[in-house]
Protein backbone atom coordinates (compact mmCIF):
# COMPACT_ATOMS: atom_id res chain seq x y z
CA UNK A 1 0.00 0.00 0.00
CA UNK A 2 0.94 3.58 -0.31
CA UNK A 3 2.59 5.47 2.05
CA UNK A 4 0.90 6.49 5.17
CA UNK A 5 1.70 9.13 8.02
CA UNK A 6 1.83 7.31 10.86
CA UNK A 7 1.51 9.39 13.71
CA UNK A 8 3.01 6.24 15.78
CA UNK A 9 1.47 5.04 19.50
CA UNK A 10 -0.19 7.92 21.33
CA UNK A 11 0.59 6.80 24.93
CA UNK A 12 -0.15 10.05 26.30
CA UNK A 13 -3.54 9.25 25.66
CA UNK A 14 -3.62 5.61 27.80
CA UNK A 15 -7.84 5.82 27.62
CA UNK A 16 -8.89 3.21 30.62
CA UNK A 17 -12.58 2.13 30.49
CA UNK A 18 -14.46 0.15 33.04
CA UNK A 19 -15.61 -3.55 32.16
CA UNK A 20 -19.05 -4.37 31.23
CA UNK A 21 -19.94 -0.44 30.90
CA UNK A 22 -20.27 1.55 27.33
CA UNK A 23 -17.62 3.36 26.28
CA UNK A 24 -17.92 6.36 23.47
CA UNK A 25 -13.61 6.49 21.82
CA UNK A 26 -12.97 9.57 19.56
CA UNK A 27 -10.11 9.29 17.01
CA UNK A 28 -7.28 11.12 18.66
CA UNK A 29 -6.47 12.29 14.91
CA UNK A 30 -9.26 14.54 14.84
CA UNK A 31 -8.28 16.18 18.54
CA UNK A 32 -4.58 16.57 18.30
CA UNK A 33 -2.89 15.54 15.37
CA UNK A 34 -4.67 17.38 12.26
CA UNK A 35 -5.79 20.75 11.45
CA UNK A 36 -9.38 19.93 10.37
CA UNK A 37 -12.69 17.72 11.92
CA UNK A 38 -14.41 14.49 11.10
CA UNK A 39 -17.03 16.47 9.26
CA UNK A 40 -14.95 18.56 6.99
CA UNK A 41 -12.62 14.83 6.23
CA UNK A 42 -15.53 13.58 5.41
CA UNK A 43 -16.99 15.99 3.36
CA UNK A 44 -13.91 15.73 1.33
CA UNK A 45 -14.61 11.84 0.60
CA UNK A 46 -12.00 10.66 3.11
CA UNK A 47 -13.06 7.75 4.79
CA UNK A 48 -11.84 6.82 8.29
CA UNK A 49 -11.20 3.08 9.20
CA UNK A 50 -10.61 1.49 12.56
CA UNK A 51 -8.72 -1.61 13.32
CA UNK A 52 -6.84 -3.10 16.28
CA UNK A 53 -4.23 -4.87 17.91
CA UNK A 54 -5.44 -7.44 20.87
CA UNK A 55 -3.41 -7.57 24.15
CA UNK A 56 0.05 -9.40 23.81
CA UNK A 57 -0.03 -10.03 19.55
CA UNK A 58 1.12 -8.17 16.81
CA UNK A 59 -1.13 -9.12 14.38
CA UNK A 60 -3.39 -6.14 13.02
CA UNK A 61 -7.08 -7.26 12.38
CA UNK A 62 -9.96 -5.36 11.34
CA UNK A 63 -12.95 -4.38 13.93
CA UNK A 64 -15.80 -6.81 13.92
CA UNK A 65 -18.73 -4.32 13.44
CA UNK A 66 -21.20 -7.24 12.81
CA UNK A 67 -20.92 -8.81 16.35
CA UNK A 68 -24.87 -8.78 18.45
CA UNK A 69 -26.64 -5.98 19.65
CA UNK A 70 -23.96 -3.98 17.52
CA UNK A 71 -22.19 -4.33 20.95
CA UNK A 72 -18.80 -2.43 19.28
CA UNK A 73 -20.36 0.33 16.64
CA UNK A 74 -18.56 3.74 14.37
CA UNK A 75 -20.22 6.60 14.46
CA UNK A 76 -18.53 9.25 13.52
CA UNK A 77 -14.98 9.61 14.00
CA UNK A 78 -16.43 7.82 17.40
CA UNK A 79 -15.93 4.02 18.30
CA UNK A 80 -18.30 2.76 20.35
CA UNK A 81 -18.56 -0.58 22.74
CA UNK A 82 -22.22 -1.33 24.46
CA UNK A 83 -21.00 -2.49 26.75
CA UNK A 84 -17.27 -2.96 27.03
CA UNK A 85 -15.28 -6.98 27.60
CA UNK A 86 -12.12 -7.21 29.16
CA UNK A 87 -10.65 -8.61 26.03
CA UNK A 88 -11.41 -5.45 24.36
CA UNK A 89 -8.19 -4.20 25.83
CA UNK A 90 -5.45 -3.88 22.92
CA UNK A 91 -3.92 -0.90 20.71
CA UNK A 92 -6.86 0.61 18.18
CA UNK A 93 -5.86 2.21 15.14
CA UNK A 94 -8.06 4.46 13.46
CA UNK A 95 -7.10 5.62 10.16
CA UNK A 96 -8.39 8.25 7.56
CA UNK A 97 -7.52 7.72 3.83
CA UNK A 98 -8.34 8.05 0.25
CA UNK A 99 -6.78 7.21 -2.90
CA UNK A 100 -4.24 10.51 -2.26
CA UNK A 101 -3.71 10.76 1.33
CA UNK A 102 -2.95 8.90 4.50
CA UNK A 103 -2.90 9.73 8.13
CA UNK A 104 -3.29 7.10 11.24
CA UNK A 105 -2.40 6.44 15.00
CA UNK A 106 -3.02 4.04 17.19
CA UNK A 107 -3.78 4.38 21.25
CA UNK A 108 -3.96 1.60 23.90
CA UNK A 109 -7.30 0.27 25.49
CA UNK A 110 -7.59 -0.71 28.66
CA UNK A 111 -10.34 -2.25 30.12
CA UNK A 112 -10.03 -2.40 33.87
CA UNK A 113 -12.14 -4.65 36.46
CA UNK A 114 -13.46 -2.67 39.48
CA UNK A 115 -14.94 -4.40 42.51
CA UNK A 116 -18.52 -3.66 44.42
CA UNK A 117 -16.71 -0.62 45.80
CA UNK A 118 -15.02 0.86 42.69
CA UNK A 119 -11.82 0.17 43.33
CA UNK A 120 -9.49 -0.31 40.40
CA UNK A 121 -6.45 0.15 38.62
CA UNK A 122 -7.95 2.72 37.30
CA UNK A 123 -5.93 6.31 37.23
CA UNK A 124 -8.40 8.78 39.26
CA UNK A 125 -8.71 12.46 38.57
CA UNK A 126 -8.30 14.37 41.40
CA UNK A 127 -10.11 17.26 42.47
CA UNK A 128 -9.17 20.28 44.52
CA UNK A 129 -11.55 22.01 46.80
CA UNK A 130 -11.00 24.61 49.24
CA UNK A 131 -11.42 24.51 52.88
CA UNK A 132 -14.17 26.35 55.02
CA UNK A 133 -15.06 28.20 51.87
CA UNK A 134 -18.41 27.77 50.87
CA UNK A 135 -20.74 25.88 48.03
CA UNK A 136 -18.38 24.14 45.46
CA UNK A 137 -19.78 21.63 43.59
CA UNK A 138 -18.40 18.67 41.63
CA UNK A 139 -19.99 17.40 38.42
CA UNK A 140 -19.89 13.97 37.68
CA UNK A 141 -17.36 13.35 34.64
CA UNK A 142 -16.59 12.37 30.93
CA UNK A 143 -20.58 11.29 30.49
CA UNK A 144 -21.25 13.44 27.52
CA UNK A 145 -22.51 11.97 24.58
CA UNK A 146 -23.56 8.81 25.67
CA UNK A 147 -27.62 9.38 25.71
CA UNK A 148 -29.70 12.48 24.58
CA UNK A 149 -30.98 15.53 26.17
CA UNK A 150 -34.34 13.53 26.16
CA UNK A 151 -33.29 10.90 28.70
CA UNK A 152 -33.02 11.48 31.89
CA UNK A 153 -30.98 9.07 33.62
CA UNK A 154 -30.76 8.54 37.04
CA UNK A 155 -27.55 8.99 38.95
CA UNK A 156 -26.03 7.91 42.61
CA UNK A 157 -23.39 9.11 44.31
CA UNK A 158 -21.15 6.97 46.94
CA UNK A 159 -18.21 7.95 48.97
CA UNK A 160 -15.82 5.00 48.90
CA UNK A 161 -18.58 2.03 49.14
CA UNK A 162 -21.01 4.24 50.70
CA UNK A 163 -24.26 5.61 49.14
CA UNK A 164 -24.36 9.79 50.05
CA UNK A 165 -27.91 9.94 50.90
CA UNK A 166 -28.28 12.04 54.07
CA UNK A 167 -28.49 15.53 54.45
CA UNK A 168 -24.90 16.35 56.16
CA UNK A 169 -22.34 19.10 54.18
CA UNK A 170 -22.31 16.66 50.68
CA UNK A 171 -25.23 16.72 49.17
CA UNK A 172 -25.85 14.72 45.69
CA UNK A 173 -27.84 17.03 43.36
CA UNK A 174 -27.89 15.12 39.98
CA UNK A 175 -25.18 15.61 38.19
CA UNK A 176 -23.63 17.58 40.88
CA UNK A 177 -22.38 16.71 44.21
CA UNK A 178 -22.61 20.08 46.21
CA UNK A 179 -19.66 20.40 49.17
CA UNK A 180 -22.11 22.97 51.46
CA UNK A 181 -18.33 23.76 53.40
CA UNK A 182 -15.75 21.27 52.47
CA UNK A 183 -13.78 19.62 55.15
CA UNK A 184 -10.48 17.83 55.98
CA UNK A 185 -12.96 14.63 56.18
CA UNK A 186 -14.37 14.88 52.93
CA UNK A 187 -11.47 13.70 51.71
CA UNK A 188 -11.29 10.49 49.54
CA UNK A 189 -12.70 8.92 46.43
CA UNK A 190 -16.07 9.67 45.16
CA UNK A 191 -18.26 8.14 42.33
CA UNK A 192 -20.86 8.90 40.43
CA UNK A 193 -23.01 5.96 39.19
CA UNK A 194 -25.17 7.00 35.69
CA UNK A 195 -28.17 4.50 34.68
CA UNK A 196 -29.60 4.97 31.62
CA UNK A 197 -31.98 3.26 29.21
CA UNK A 198 -31.33 2.57 25.60
CA UNK A 199 -33.28 0.09 23.12
CA UNK A 200 -34.37 -1.52 26.00
CA UNK A 201 -31.14 -2.15 28.01
CA UNK A 202 -29.76 -0.38 31.11
CA UNK A 203 -26.36 0.39 30.72
CA UNK A 204 -24.20 1.99 33.84
CA UNK A 205 -21.44 4.40 33.43
CA UNK A 206 -18.79 4.77 36.25
CA UNK A 207 -16.82 7.67 37.32
CA UNK A 208 -14.69 8.14 40.26
CA UNK A 209 -12.80 11.11 41.62
CA UNK A 210 -10.60 11.94 44.07
CA UNK A 211 -11.51 14.73 46.16
CA UNK A 212 -8.42 16.79 47.99
CA UNK A 213 -9.66 19.47 50.59
CA UNK A 214 -7.06 22.13 50.25
CA UNK A 215 -6.40 25.56 52.07
CA UNK A 216 -8.73 28.65 51.29
CA UNK A 217 -7.70 31.52 48.87
CA UNK A 218 -9.66 33.53 51.76
CA UNK A 219 -6.80 32.49 54.38
CA UNK A 220 -3.77 32.76 51.69
CA UNK A 221 -0.83 35.21 52.77
CA UNK A 222 2.27 36.02 51.50
CA UNK A 223 5.45 33.49 51.86
CA UNK A 224 6.34 33.58 55.69
CA UNK A 225 9.88 33.48 56.13
CA UNK A 226 10.34 31.38 59.94
CA UNK A 227 14.40 31.30 59.23
CA UNK A 228 16.52 33.19 58.99
CA UNK A 229 14.98 35.32 61.79
CA UNK A 230 16.34 38.32 63.83
CA UNK A 231 16.60 35.84 67.13
CA UNK A 232 19.24 34.08 65.38
CA UNK A 233 22.66 34.78 64.70
CA UNK A 234 25.28 32.58 63.11
CA UNK A 235 28.54 32.95 65.27
CA UNK A 236 31.69 30.84 63.35
CA UNK A 237 34.97 30.98 63.68
CA UNK A 238 37.10 30.39 60.16
CA UNK A 239 38.01 27.24 59.29
CA UNK A 240 34.26 26.02 60.69
CA UNK A 241 30.87 24.84 58.61
CA UNK A 242 28.51 27.98 58.16
CA UNK A 243 24.97 26.19 58.23
CA UNK A 244 22.30 28.64 57.62
CA UNK A 245 18.64 27.49 57.03
CA UNK A 246 15.76 29.39 54.94
CA UNK A 247 12.40 28.01 56.31
CA UNK A 248 9.55 29.27 54.03
CA UNK A 249 5.97 28.29 54.43
CA UNK A 250 3.54 29.54 51.48
CA UNK A 251 -0.44 29.71 51.63
CA UNK A 252 -1.80 26.60 48.95
CA UNK A 253 -2.66 28.35 46.24
CA UNK A 254 -3.84 26.91 42.87
CA UNK A 255 -1.69 26.87 40.44
CA UNK A 256 1.12 29.14 42.26
CA UNK A 257 4.63 28.46 41.66
CA UNK A 258 6.36 28.60 44.94
CA UNK A 259 10.28 29.38 44.58
CA UNK A 260 13.19 30.05 47.50
CA UNK A 261 16.51 30.85 46.67
CA UNK A 262 19.90 32.48 48.51
CA UNK A 263 21.90 35.40 47.58
CA UNK A 264 25.19 35.79 48.69
CA UNK A 265 26.41 39.42 48.19
CA UNK A 266 23.08 40.08 46.07
CA UNK A 267 23.98 37.21 44.00
CA UNK A 268 22.89 33.47 43.50
CA UNK A 269 25.41 31.35 44.71
CA UNK A 270 26.32 29.75 41.15
CA UNK A 271 27.31 33.33 40.03
CA UNK A 272 30.36 33.52 42.85
CA UNK A 273 33.23 31.54 43.85
CA UNK A 274 32.37 30.31 46.61
CA UNK A 275 31.95 26.67 47.53
CA UNK A 276 28.61 26.77 48.66
CA UNK A 277 26.24 23.86 48.99
CA UNK A 278 21.99 24.35 49.15
CA UNK A 279 19.82 21.66 50.10
CA UNK A 280 16.31 21.83 49.95
CA UNK A 281 13.32 19.56 51.40
CA UNK A 282 9.70 20.34 51.35
CA UNK A 283 6.57 19.38 53.32
CA UNK A 284 2.90 19.92 53.13
CA UNK A 285 0.24 19.87 55.64
CA UNK A 286 -3.24 18.51 55.23
CA UNK A 287 -4.42 21.30 53.32
CA UNK A 288 -1.65 21.37 51.00
CA UNK A 289 0.28 24.39 52.18
CA UNK A 290 4.27 24.08 51.75
CA UNK A 291 7.09 24.32 54.07
CA UNK A 292 10.50 24.62 51.98
CA UNK A 293 13.93 24.77 53.83
CA UNK A 294 16.89 25.33 51.72
CA UNK A 295 20.10 25.06 54.09
CA UNK A 296 22.68 26.93 52.92
CA UNK A 297 25.92 25.28 53.37
CA UNK A 298 29.62 25.92 53.37
CA UNK A 299 32.36 23.74 54.73
CA UNK A 300 35.29 25.78 55.55
CA UNK A 301 34.31 29.38 56.13
CA UNK A 302 36.75 31.72 55.64
CA UNK A 303 36.49 35.60 57.38
CA UNK A 304 35.65 37.21 54.41
CA UNK A 305 32.73 34.65 53.96
CA UNK A 306 32.05 35.71 57.36
CA UNK A 307 31.49 39.48 55.98
CA UNK A 308 29.50 38.96 53.26
CA UNK A 309 25.85 39.27 52.83
CA UNK A 310 23.47 36.44 52.95
CA UNK A 311 19.55 36.41 52.13
CA UNK A 312 16.54 34.08 51.77
CA UNK A 313 14.14 34.89 49.12
CA UNK A 314 10.91 33.72 48.60
CA UNK A 315 7.95 34.35 46.04
CA UNK A 316 4.02 33.03 45.20
CA UNK A 317 1.65 34.17 43.63
CA UNK A 318 0.54 36.15 46.75
CA UNK A 319 4.22 38.04 46.45
CA UNK A 320 7.73 38.55 47.40
CA UNK A 321 9.86 38.50 51.21
CA UNK A 322 13.10 38.28 52.01
CA UNK A 323 15.19 37.88 54.96
CA UNK A 324 18.83 38.53 55.60
CA UNK A 325 20.68 35.86 58.14
CA UNK A 326 22.89 37.46 60.55
CA UNK A 327 26.58 36.17 60.40
CA UNK A 328 29.26 37.04 62.37
CA UNK A 329 32.74 36.42 62.73
CA UNK A 330 33.41 34.31 66.39
CA UNK A 331 35.71 36.71 68.62
CA UNK A 332 38.42 34.07 69.69
CA UNK A 333 38.26 33.64 73.53
CA UNK A 334 41.16 35.25 75.34
CA UNK A 335 44.32 32.82 75.98
CA UNK A 336 43.96 33.05 79.94
CA UNK A 337 48.10 33.20 80.36
CA UNK A 338 48.74 36.32 78.58
CA UNK A 339 45.88 38.51 77.97
CA UNK A 340 44.23 37.21 81.32
CA UNK A 341 47.37 37.98 83.36
CA UNK A 342 47.76 41.25 81.30
CA UNK A 343 44.97 42.55 82.42
CA UNK A 344 45.97 41.66 86.34
CA UNK A 345 48.78 43.59 86.05
CA UNK A 346 51.26 40.52 85.74
CA UNK A 347 54.71 40.51 84.98
CA UNK B 1 -44.68 17.23 32.45
CA UNK B 2 -44.03 17.84 36.00
CA UNK B 3 -46.64 17.68 38.40
CA UNK B 4 -47.33 17.83 42.20
CA UNK B 5 -50.89 17.03 43.34
CA UNK B 6 -51.45 17.87 46.94
CA UNK B 7 -54.26 16.65 49.09
CA UNK B 8 -57.38 18.82 50.17
CA UNK B 9 -57.73 21.21 52.99
CA UNK B 10 -57.81 20.50 56.12
CA UNK B 11 -59.48 22.26 59.28
CA UNK B 12 -57.79 20.62 62.68
CA UNK B 13 -58.24 21.79 66.23
CA UNK B 14 -55.87 22.76 69.05
CA UNK B 15 -53.38 19.54 69.31
CA UNK B 16 -54.63 17.61 66.56
CA UNK B 17 -51.96 15.81 64.03
CA UNK B 18 -52.66 16.72 60.06
CA UNK B 19 -50.42 14.68 57.27
CA UNK B 20 -50.53 16.39 54.08
CA UNK B 21 -49.83 14.16 51.31
CA UNK B 22 -48.42 15.15 47.56
CA UNK B 23 -47.71 12.97 44.50
CA UNK B 24 -45.95 13.46 42.10
CA UNK B 25 -45.49 12.45 38.55
CA UNK B 26 -43.82 13.21 35.45
CA UNK B 27 -40.08 12.97 36.26
CA UNK B 28 -37.93 9.97 38.69
CA UNK B 29 -39.43 10.29 41.92
CA UNK B 30 -36.57 9.11 43.15
CA UNK B 31 -33.96 12.02 41.47
CA UNK B 32 -35.05 14.55 43.43
CA UNK B 33 -35.52 15.94 47.11
CA UNK B 34 -39.07 17.12 48.07
CA UNK B 35 -39.00 20.30 50.14
CA UNK B 36 -42.28 21.57 52.51
CA UNK B 37 -42.43 25.09 52.88
CA UNK B 38 -45.70 27.23 54.26
CA UNK B 39 -47.25 29.98 53.86
CA UNK B 40 -49.38 31.71 56.58
CA UNK B 41 -51.94 34.01 55.60
CA UNK B 42 -50.73 37.38 54.29
CA UNK B 43 -47.00 36.37 55.56
CA UNK B 44 -43.48 35.26 53.73
CA UNK B 45 -42.66 31.47 52.88
CA UNK B 46 -41.34 29.22 55.67
CA UNK B 47 -38.97 26.44 55.16
CA UNK B 48 -40.20 23.10 57.37
CA UNK B 49 -37.85 20.77 55.86
CA UNK B 50 -36.30 18.11 52.90
CA UNK B 51 -37.02 14.69 52.57
CA UNK B 52 -34.83 12.35 50.21
CA UNK B 53 -37.56 10.35 48.41
CA UNK B 54 -34.30 7.96 47.14
CA UNK B 55 -33.23 6.49 50.86
CA UNK B 56 -35.85 8.20 52.50
CA UNK B 57 -33.66 10.40 54.98
CA UNK B 58 -34.91 14.01 56.07
CA UNK B 59 -34.03 17.10 57.66
CA UNK B 60 -35.97 19.40 59.38
CA UNK B 61 -35.86 22.89 60.08
CA UNK B 62 -35.05 23.50 64.10
CA UNK B 63 -38.43 25.44 64.38
CA UNK B 64 -40.52 21.80 63.39
CA UNK B 65 -38.00 19.25 65.24
CA UNK B 66 -40.52 17.12 67.01
CA UNK B 67 -43.16 17.87 65.70
CA UNK B 68 -43.07 17.23 62.02
CA UNK B 69 -42.46 14.31 60.16
CA UNK B 70 -41.75 13.65 56.69
CA UNK B 71 -42.05 10.41 54.61
CA UNK B 72 -42.31 9.15 51.24
CA UNK B 73 -43.70 5.85 49.22
CA UNK B 74 -41.76 5.04 46.24
CA UNK B 75 -44.67 2.57 44.53
CA UNK B 76 -46.89 5.59 44.53
CA UNK B 77 -44.39 8.28 44.39
CA UNK B 78 -45.86 10.45 47.11
CA UNK B 79 -44.55 11.98 50.11
CA UNK B 80 -46.16 12.60 52.97
CA UNK B 81 -45.75 15.69 55.95
CA UNK B 82 -47.04 15.26 59.33
CA UNK B 83 -47.53 18.08 62.06
CA UNK B 84 -48.63 17.05 65.46
CA UNK B 85 -49.67 19.49 68.70
CA UNK B 86 -51.18 21.81 66.08
CA UNK B 87 -51.69 25.47 67.58
CA UNK B 88 -53.48 28.01 65.92
CA UNK B 89 -50.32 29.82 64.43
CA UNK B 90 -50.34 26.66 61.84
CA UNK B 91 -53.09 27.80 59.80
CA UNK B 92 -51.18 28.33 56.63
CA UNK B 93 -50.83 27.15 53.40
CA UNK B 94 -48.47 24.21 52.80
CA UNK B 95 -46.63 23.61 49.59
CA UNK B 96 -44.62 20.74 48.65
CA UNK B 97 -41.92 21.69 46.45
CA UNK B 98 -39.09 19.65 44.39
CA UNK B 99 -36.18 20.75 43.88
CA UNK B 100 -31.97 20.07 44.93
CA UNK B 101 -30.98 22.01 47.83
CA UNK B 102 -28.24 24.50 46.44
CA UNK B 103 -29.93 25.54 43.29
CA UNK B 104 -33.50 26.39 43.85
CA UNK B 105 -36.83 24.79 44.26
CA UNK B 106 -38.06 24.44 40.52
CA UNK B 107 -41.35 22.84 40.76
CA UNK B 108 -44.14 23.42 43.96
CA UNK B 109 -47.78 21.67 44.57
CA UNK B 110 -50.71 23.78 44.23
CA UNK B 111 -50.58 24.13 48.16
CA UNK B 112 -52.77 22.54 51.29
CA UNK B 113 -54.86 24.74 52.89
CA UNK B 114 -54.79 23.90 57.04
CA UNK B 115 -56.93 25.98 59.04
CA UNK B 116 -56.08 25.41 63.17
CA UNK B 117 -59.31 26.71 65.19
CA UNK B 118 -61.02 25.79 68.09
CA UNK C 1 -38.38 38.53 61.58
CA UNK C 2 -36.07 36.97 58.70
CA UNK C 3 -32.41 36.00 58.36
CA UNK C 4 -32.45 37.58 55.22
CA UNK C 5 -33.64 41.16 54.82
CA UNK C 6 -35.91 42.80 51.64
CA UNK C 7 -37.71 45.52 51.23
CA UNK C 8 -41.13 45.03 51.74
CA UNK C 9 -42.17 47.04 48.42
CA UNK C 10 -41.10 48.82 45.44
CA UNK C 11 -42.99 50.49 42.79
CA UNK C 12 -42.41 51.28 39.27
CA UNK C 13 -44.11 51.96 35.80
CA UNK C 14 -44.42 49.77 32.72
CA UNK C 15 -41.41 49.65 30.87
CA UNK C 16 -39.29 51.00 33.65
CA UNK C 17 -36.48 49.03 35.28
CA UNK C 18 -37.04 47.67 39.12
CA UNK C 19 -34.16 46.04 41.40
CA UNK C 20 -34.61 44.30 44.43
CA UNK C 21 -32.19 43.63 46.83
CA UNK C 22 -31.78 40.76 49.34
CA UNK C 23 -29.32 40.95 52.59
CA UNK C 24 -27.91 38.43 54.44
CA UNK C 25 -24.49 37.80 55.89
CA UNK C 26 -21.57 35.61 55.60
CA UNK C 27 -22.98 32.45 56.97
CA UNK C 28 -25.64 32.79 54.48
CA UNK C 29 -25.27 34.14 51.12
CA UNK C 30 -21.89 35.32 51.73
CA UNK C 31 -20.93 31.91 50.98
CA UNK C 32 -23.75 30.00 49.07
CA UNK C 33 -25.74 30.54 45.56
CA UNK C 34 -29.16 32.65 46.13
CA UNK C 35 -32.69 31.50 44.46
CA UNK C 36 -35.38 33.94 43.56
CA UNK C 37 -39.20 33.46 43.70
CA UNK C 38 -42.39 35.36 41.86
CA UNK C 39 -45.92 34.36 43.85
CA UNK C 40 -48.31 36.05 41.46
CA UNK C 41 -51.78 36.11 44.05
CA UNK C 42 -53.12 33.28 44.50
CA UNK C 43 -50.80 30.95 43.10
CA UNK C 44 -47.78 28.57 44.15
CA UNK C 45 -44.29 30.85 44.04
CA UNK C 46 -42.02 30.12 40.69
CA UNK C 47 -38.55 29.77 40.54
CA UNK C 48 -37.22 32.76 38.42
CA UNK C 49 -33.27 32.94 39.28
CA UNK C 50 -31.08 30.15 40.67
CA UNK C 51 -27.24 29.95 41.34
CA UNK C 52 -27.33 33.45 41.65
CA UNK C 53 -28.02 34.59 38.01
CA UNK C 54 -29.12 31.66 36.07
CA UNK C 55 -32.56 31.68 34.23
CA UNK C 56 -34.52 28.50 34.47
CA UNK C 57 -35.98 27.62 30.56
CA UNK C 58 -38.95 29.55 29.89
CA UNK C 59 -38.13 32.94 32.63
CA UNK C 60 -37.50 35.69 30.17
CA UNK C 61 -34.44 37.81 30.29
CA UNK C 62 -35.95 40.91 31.57
CA UNK C 63 -35.54 38.63 35.09
CA UNK C 64 -31.86 38.58 35.87
CA UNK C 65 -29.88 37.92 38.98
CA UNK C 66 -26.60 39.36 41.00
CA UNK C 67 -24.60 38.93 43.91
CA UNK C 68 -22.18 40.75 45.70
CA UNK C 69 -20.57 39.95 48.81
CA UNK C 70 -23.49 39.04 51.61
CA UNK C 71 -26.35 40.54 49.00
CA UNK C 72 -28.00 39.38 45.95
CA UNK C 73 -30.58 41.91 43.89
CA UNK C 74 -32.60 40.55 41.53
CA UNK C 75 -33.30 42.80 38.74
CA UNK C 76 -36.74 43.26 36.41
CA UNK C 77 -36.48 45.72 32.91
CA UNK C 78 -39.01 46.36 30.76
CA UNK C 79 -41.80 46.24 33.48
CA UNK C 80 -45.00 44.86 32.47
CA UNK C 81 -48.49 44.51 34.45
CA UNK C 82 -48.28 40.53 34.65
CA UNK C 83 -44.96 40.97 37.20
CA UNK C 84 -46.87 42.64 39.65
CA UNK C 85 -46.15 39.68 42.66
CA UNK C 86 -44.57 38.99 45.56
CA UNK C 87 -40.93 38.29 44.91
CA UNK C 88 -38.81 35.87 47.30
CA UNK C 89 -34.85 35.53 47.81
CA UNK C 90 -33.65 32.24 48.95
CA UNK C 91 -30.62 30.60 49.97
CA UNK C 92 -29.65 27.79 52.95
CA UNK C 93 -26.88 27.75 55.73
CA UNK C 94 -25.04 24.77 56.94
CA UNK C 95 -23.70 24.74 60.61
CA UNK C 96 -23.64 21.06 60.96
CA UNK C 97 -27.47 21.22 60.19
CA UNK C 98 -29.09 22.08 56.95
CA UNK C 99 -31.20 25.55 57.03
CA UNK C 100 -33.41 26.82 54.10
CA UNK C 101 -33.91 30.49 54.57
CA UNK C 102 -36.19 32.99 53.03
CA UNK C 103 -36.49 36.17 52.94
CA UNK C 104 -39.28 38.29 53.97
CA UNK C 105 -40.53 39.47 50.58
CA UNK C 106 -41.35 42.18 48.68
CA UNK C 107 -44.60 43.45 47.01
CA UNK C 108 -43.77 45.09 43.47
CA UNK C 109 -46.89 47.24 41.91
CA UNK C 110 -46.65 48.22 38.81
CA UNK C 111 -48.34 51.64 38.63
Known amino acids: SERCDDWGLDTMRQIQVFEDEPARIKCPLFEHFLKFNYSTAHSAGLTLIWYWTRQDRDLEEPINFRLPENRISKEKDVLWFRPTLLNDTGNYTCMLRNTTYCSKVAFPLEVVQKDSCFNSPMKLPVHKLYIEYGIQRITCPNVDGYFPSSVKPTITWYMGCYKIQNFNNVIPEGMNLSFLIALISNNGNYTCVVTYPENGRTFHLTRTLTVKVVGSPKNAVPPVIHSPNDHVVYEKEPGEELLIPCTVYFSFLMDSRNEVWWTIDGKKPDDITIDVTINESISHSRTEDETRTQILSIKKVTSEDLKRSYVCHARSAKGEVAKAAKVKQKVPAPRYTVELACGFGAT | QVQLVQSGAEVKKPGASVKVSCKAS????????MHWVRQAPGQGLEWMGI????????SYAQKFQGRVTMTRDTSTSTVYMELSSLRSEDTAVYYC???????????WGQGTLVTVSS | QSVLTQPPSVSAAPGQKVTISCSGS????????VSWYQQLPGTAPKLLIY???KRPSGIPDRFSGSKSGTSATLGITGLQTEDEADYYC????????????FGGGTKLTVL
Open chain 2, 97 to 107: ARGFVTSGIDY
Open chain 2, 26 to 33: GYTFTSYY
Open chain 2, 51 to 58: INPSGGST
Open chain 3, 26 to 33: SSNIGNNY
Open chain 3, 51 to 53: DNN
Open chain 3, 90 to 101: QTWTYTGRLWIV
